[in-house]
């Protein structure tokens, strides 16, 4: 039974090549977290995914695919406001040691210019476990569609655990959710990155317990400033 690496519950394999900005952060050969390619040199993920060194898998929906790019990364920059106690500001930029080669299978994610409203249908993706609490890690990238939930409705579930830069998503009475191994991975709505998988209740996929994401639209300035600062 695992926790900090994360998963997709009640989803299905993503359409091949539909998430070319999706990356996996590996510890050695093992999945640690998901992430997204922001540009040739930078990956965005969750702050709680921090390690000393990362191997970044890009360019294939299948972990272990020998055609995939694997790039080492040894520098990462957490949001300075990240709290290990409340998990607010749960995002981090990882700088690749060498540039990613862009292709039809490796593309930059679109950062948001606005925050999408509650009710918007979005897709969360990852290689995290598809069962919980016992784990079953897929080799192929999994996707599930969820809807953004208003802060008012989400607060009914999570009370004061919810901070204002956290975003909730789920489907009422459904198990559809992220889980162990999906952390740091993308929640994409109308073609733009709106969330990064942050946390949820456990075992994963409990109906009416939404997934909680870092609300990326609140952090675009920090993302751009940090990449510029550490060029």
């Amino acid at each position: 039974e695992e926790a900090q690496g994360d998963k997709i519950i009640d989803g299905a394999p993503c359409a091949r090549g539909s998430h070319p900005w999706q990356v996996a952060l590996l510890s050695g050969n093992q999945l640690h977290c998901g992430g997204v390619l922001v540009n040739e040199r930078w990956v965005l993920t969750a702050a709680h995914c921090k390690m000393n060194e990362y191997t970044v898998h890009l360019g294939s929906d299948t972990l272990g695919d020998r055609r995939a790019q694997r790039i080492k990364a040894s520098k990462s920059f957490r949001h300075p406001g990240y709290s290990t106690q409340t998990h607010v500001n749960d995002l981090m930029l990882v700088k690749l040691n060498s540039q990613a080669r862009l292709s039809s299978m490796v593309k930059k994610v679109r950062l948001p210019s606005r925050c999408e409203p509650p009710g918007t249908t979005c897709t969360v993706s990852g290689w995290g476990t598809t069962t919980s609490p016992d784990v079953t890690f897929p080799s192929d990238l999994m996707c599930v569609d969820v809807k953004l939930i208003s802060p008012q409705d989400c607060t009914k579930v999570y009370k004061d655990l919810l901070e204002n830069s956290m975003l909730c998503a789920g489907i009422p009475d459904s198990k559809k959710n992220a889980c162990n191994g999906d952390s740091g991975g993308p929640l994409v709505c109308r073609g733009t990155l709106q969330g990064l998988v942050s946390w949820g209740t456990f075992p994963c996929g409990q109906p009416n317990d939404p997934g909680v994401y870092t609300q990326v639209c609140k952090f675009t300035k920090w993302i751009n400033d940090t990449m510029k600062k550490h060029r």
């Epitope: 900090q4 106690q85 999906d182 952390s183 942050s198 946390w199 456990f202």
Partner: antibody, heavy 122, light 108 residues
Framework: QVQLVQSGAEVKKPGASVKVSCKAS????????IHWVRQAPGQGLEWMGS????????NYAQELQGRVTMTTDTSTSTAYMELRSLRSDDTAVYYC???????????????WGQGTMVTVSS | DIQMTQSPSSLSASVGDRVTITCRAS??????LNWYQQKPGKAPKLLIY???SLQSGVPSRFSGSGSGTDFTLTISSLQPEDFATYYC??????????FGGGTKVEIK
Amino acid sequence: QVQLVQSGAEVKKPGASVKVSCKASGYTFTSEGIHWVRQAPGQGLEWMGSISASSGDTNYAQELQGRVTMTTDTSTSTAYMELRSLRSDDTAVYYCARAAGYGARHWYFDLWGQGTMVTVSS
Amino acid sequence: DIQMTQSPSSLSASVGDRVTITCRASQSISSYLNWYQQKPGKAPKLLIYGASSLQSGVPSRFSGSGSGTDFTLTISSLQPEDFATYYCDQFYSTPPITFGGGTKVEIK
């Protein structure tokens, strides 16, 4: 087999330090957090702190701040808890425990070590 | 910090009895409360998580209920192996994780 195996009993003098180890097996050590909980003879459970095996992030109980250090060695899947400036009231069984959860949050202890008795006596 | 108060601190019961233990939080912890069983010389063992979910492998005579500040652990028909000390804890507002003081269930 999923388990946490702790180091053996220790007898220490007041003012000394003790370092207890907790070796994980049967699961991905870096995907979990390890917590330390102690229990004085005939008393209840007291949370001491936690460490993320992957990031090294720590949170310590306020009353132990400055005396306790938690570390991990990912190459051996082992967590360590060092307690310094020992006093007689630190005499307790020390447990490591794995916290179950997903992502940044954890919700309960689903796996415990067998415990390590630390006796502080002059 | 959230304080957890368990009652009673001890109780005597007979095999077959229905036993109820309560845990009260000093402020609302939603349903993020867990129950553990500890036998002498052994580590605690998870029984119930999230106030009411039974941990895999735990007999169905154990059940949990409650939300907010008041929680109950019930053993529907006490068995000889159930004589132990029971603890609640909260993972809602952390750190710190806080435990109740324990309830010792003894043979009458």
